[in-house]
Interface confidence: medium
């Protein structure tokens, strides 16, 4: 369907009935009869044809082809072309339910001049003109536009049709009749009347024998197919293309006859080689011929059509393109057209429907839809613009939040977070003892760099993990008494041993870190200060990175905090092994630098609870 | 890098003519429609014209309000668009862009904007 | 012609606020809809084409939703270079229309 952008390019001469130029007596008629045009079954039909409940009202266009293809580039309307009147005038109303449009009154008729080519091809286009208060006059969009290819006879009774066009849904019938004296299937054997002279008259082409009884039904061959076959002398089966054996039941395909041309033997079935149908040329005015199975077919130049390009003289007052083409023509009304076609059509005419998306369009494995009004592509992650030609730039736009520094690559953003923030977009406050990682009642403390887990008597590890005994016999002296449940227990050491554990645990702490920045160089710096102990919550009792946490007023860790648990946190920080004779009370400054900026020579602290433990670790 | 210049504004009076252009660079002129868009002092956008690319013709459409009284052309040689304006009125004064439309097939409807350029009607 | 009503035109909001503009059609558009940021100097810039279509370099708490032919403009957390004039584009059909705009203002 035609977006309404359409209905501006289409020329206002074409809407002018078809001007059909002098020409000899047609050889016949082929008609079309509109029976419907409305919404089809299911969901999603329009209500209306009218927009925005503008009085609006149909009229059709139909274009008819021979041979096979409807779909031909360079195959204008070459059996001819006809334009109905306007249909009533219809308004919607409101509530109403849908109903079948008024239409036209009257068949769609399309003379064709020579022989009827039994194979045809049409396109019938549904146009509704709105008769609103435009600028301008009128205006015109394609409704629906429906294209088949079909085996016909002349002579025959009235074939039925239904087309969908989207979600259009269009009833006809058709026929090909031949003009007397005209007759046959082909309407190319020619008659008199009883009373009239036995001549060729003038016009009458191809000046063939006469018949006195031109009433008499022709009969063909007994069981000759109604389908694919026909007859043009009684008794006889003559093969449609596509078709071939005595009673024209074998498709081509699986015949083993050989040459193209000639008529069809009654014996073989198979075609007798004949004179080509291209010798001599039959194509005026520079056309070009081409064989068919049955006959010929020419390709015009621009301004010429007909089946054998004799008919000249075309202009855009003939309303020659299809599909919402801009008709450009010279002054002259001899000039020949030029057809400007809108996006998604090609040919001479328009007539040729493209599949833009085949030329796959959209760049970076983007999907192509074709809408009709434009092409659309729907991107991968990481691209963008309307072919998905642009690389994202992730970090357009400051994409990271409170100071976070954006690393661009594999179209999703990522980012490297400052001290203290965390998630996708650095807008969230990190939590990495959310998780509770600590094991056996350990404590769990938010660090610059991860977290530090200061475990329970008899346990060890970065996670509390180990027992400090495996047999379960600690090496350490009972907590003294005087301790709060749920207070970190404290050890009273002499200072010397207490730097001598606390020299180990430094060690320890330090080729970690040696281990973890080796193989984990690319970790976001986005872990923070902050605690949650298992089971209660607790923090560090300083405020550190931006936490805010209200002093308690003991030695232990303060009860009130303030933090945002986080979206994605890695729980692979950097770890103290502790001993359960130290209570990390203090980290006044980072332990380690955040692995992402290595700021080397840093002097960093760890606090214990008395000032002989405080160690300095280059 | 696409690239859209106006220039030709100023102070004319009510009743008379000018012409604005449009510079632009950075993509292939022909290949895409172009619009004129005006703002009126502290007014919404409003569309004027278009012209359509190559492939089409170099049709144009217009809005209603300028109908008659305006035409949009193009240079395509020099890449330049243009608004001929004519029978001016004080209601015409306002701060005139170009914008890039569509190249026929994909949607890059007003996806570049020139700096605008100021025209005033008045006595 | 296509209306198009553009709501709130005036609207306060601070920073790290998020924030909502509409614009309904006055007739069927499908999805053929653009949003556009005015800047105090009057640079214009197209954010979202096709209704929901994040143009390249515009930051990703910019993003655009339909619901038949109501058209919304959402901004997530809003920044500083936010603070604007906003205004949506039907390119459905001739005449193109605007919405009346929204300015954006900082609280």
């Known amino acids: 369907m035609v977006s309404p952008r359409m209905s501006g390019l289409l020329s206002q001469t074409v809407i002018l009935a078809l001007i059909f130029l002098p020409q000899t007596r047609p050889a016949g008629v082929f008609e079309l009869q509109i029976h419907s045009f409305g919404p089809g079954p299911g969901p999603g039909a329009p209500r209306s044809p009218c927009s925005a409940r503008l009085p609006c009202r149909l009229f059709f266009r139909v274009c008819l082809k021979p041979g096979l293809s409807e779909e031909a580039a360079e195959s204008p309307c070459a059996l001819g072309a006809a334009l109905s009147a306007r249909g009533p005038v219809y308004t919607e109303q409101p509530g109403a339910p849908a109903p079948d449009l008024p239409l036209p009154d009257g068949l769609l008729q399309v003379p064709f001049r020579d022989a009827w080519p039994g194979t045809f091809s049409f396109i019938i286009e549904t146009w509704r003109e709105e008769l609103g208060d435009q600028i301008g006059g009128p205006a015109w969009s394609l409704l629906a536009r429906v294209a088949g290819r079909r085996r016909l006879a002349a002579g025959g009774p009235w074939a039925r049709d239904i087309q969908r066009a989207g979600a259009w849904e269009l009833r006809f019938s058709y026929r090909a009749r031949c003009e007397p004296p005209a007759v046959g299937t082909a309407c190319t054997r020619l008659c008199r009347p009883r009373s009239a002279p036995s001549r060729c008259g003038p016009g009458l082409r191809p000046c063939a024998p006469l018949e006195d009884e031109c009433e008499a039904p022709l009969v063909c061959r007994a069981g000759c197919s109604p389908e694919h076959g026909f007859c043009e002398q009684p008794g006889e089966c003559r093969c449609l293309e596509g078709w071939t054996g005595p009673l024209c039941t074998v498709p081509v395909s699986t015949s083993s006859c050989l040459s193209p041309r000639g008529p069809s033997s009654a014996t073989t079935g198979c075609l007798v080689p004949g004179p080509g149908p291209c010798d001599g040329n039959p194509c005026a005015n520079g056309g070009s011929c081409s064989e068919t199975p049955r006959s010929f077919e020419c390709t015009c130049p621009r301004g010429f059509y007909g089946l054998r390009c004799e008919v000249s003289g075309v202009t855009c007052a003939d309303g020659p393109c299809f599909n919402g083409g801009l008709c450009v023509g010279g002054a002259d009304p001899d000039s020949a057209y030029i057809c400007h076609c809108p996006p998604g059509f090609q040919g001479s005419n328009c007539e040729k429907r493209v599949d833009r998306c085949s030329l796959q369009p959209c760049r970076n494995g983007g999907l192509c839809l074709d809408l009709g009004h434009a092409l659309r592509c729907r991107c991968r992650a990481g691209f963008a613009g309307p072919r998905c030609e642009h690389d994202l730039d992730d970090c357009a736009g400051r994409a990271c939040a409170n100071g976070g520094t954006c690393v661009e690559g594999g179209g999703a953003h990522r980012c490297s977070c400052a001290l203290g923030f965390g998630g996708r977009d650095c807008r969230e406050r990190a939590d990495p003892c959310a998780a509770r990682p600590c094991a056996h009642g350990g404590r769990c403390y938010a660090h610059f760099s991860g977290l530090v887990c200061a475990c329970a008597p008899g346990y060890m590890g970065a996670r509390c993990e180990f027992p400090v005994h495996p047999d379960g016999a600690s090496a350490l002296p009972a907590a003294p008494p005087g301790l709060r449940p749920g207070d970190p227990q404290r050890y009273l050491l002499p200072p010397a041993l207490g730097l001598l554990v606390a020299a180990g645990v430094a060690g320890a702490a330090l080729l970690l870190v040696h281990v973890r920045r080796r193989g984990h160089s690319q970790d976001a710096g986005s872990r923070l200060l902050a605690g949650t102990p298992e089971p209660s919550v607790h923090a560090l009792p300083d405020a550190l990175n931006n936490l805010r946490t209200q002093e308690g007023s003991g030695d232990g860790p303060s009860s009130s905090v303030d933090w945002n648990r986080p979206e994605d946190v890695d729980p692979q920080g950097i770890y103290v092994i502790s001993a359960p004779s130290i209570y990390a009370r203090e980290v006044a400054t980072p332990l380690f630098p955040p692995l992402h900026t290595g700021r080397a020579g840093q002097r960093q602290h760890l606090l214990f609870p008395y000032p002989s433990s405080i160690l300095s670790v280059k | 890098e696409v690239k859209l210049v106006e220039s030709g504004g100023g102070l004319v009076q009510p009743g008379g003519s000018l012409s604005l252009s449009c510079a632009a660079s950075?993509?292939?002129?022909?290949?895409?429609?172009m619009n004129w868009v005006r703002q009126p002092p502290g007014k919404a956008l409003e569309w004027l014209a278009l012209?359509?690319?190559?492939?089409?013709?170099?049709?144009?459409e217009y809005n209603a309000s300028v109908k008659g009284r305006f035409t949009i052309s193009r240079d395509n040689s020099q890449n330049i668009l243009y608004l001929q304006m004519n029978a001016l009125r004080a209601e015409d004064s306002a701060t005139y862009y170009c914008?890039?439309?569509?190249?026929?097939?994909?949607?890059?409807?007003?996806?570049?904007w020139g700096q605008g350029t100021t025209l005033t009607v008045s006595s | 012609d296509i209306q198009m009503t553009q709501s709130p035109s005036s609207l306060s909001a601070s920073l790290g606020e998020r924030v909502s503009l509409t614009c309904r059609a006055s007739?069927?558009?499908?999805?053929?809809l653009s949003w556009l940021q005015q800047k105090p100097d009057g640079t214009i810039k197209r954010l979202i084409f096709a209704a929901s279509t994040l143009d390249s370099g515009v930051p990703k708490r910019f993003s655009g939703s339909r619901s038949g032919s109501d058209f919304s403009l959402s901004i997530s957390s809003l920044e500083s270079e936010d603070f604007a004039d906003y205004y949506c584009?039907?390119?459905?059909?001739?005449?193109?229309?605007f919405g009346s705009g929204t300015k954006l203002e900082i609280k």
């Open positions: 914008a890039r439309d569509s190249d026929g097939y994909y949607e890059y409807y007003f996806d570049y």
């Open positions: 012209i359509r690319n190559k492939a089409n013709g170099y049709t144009t």
């Open positions: 950075g993509f292939t002129f022909t290949d895409y429609y």
């Open positions: 584009l039907q390119y459905a059909s001739y005449p193109y229309t």
């Open positions: 007739q069927e558009i499908s999805d053929y």
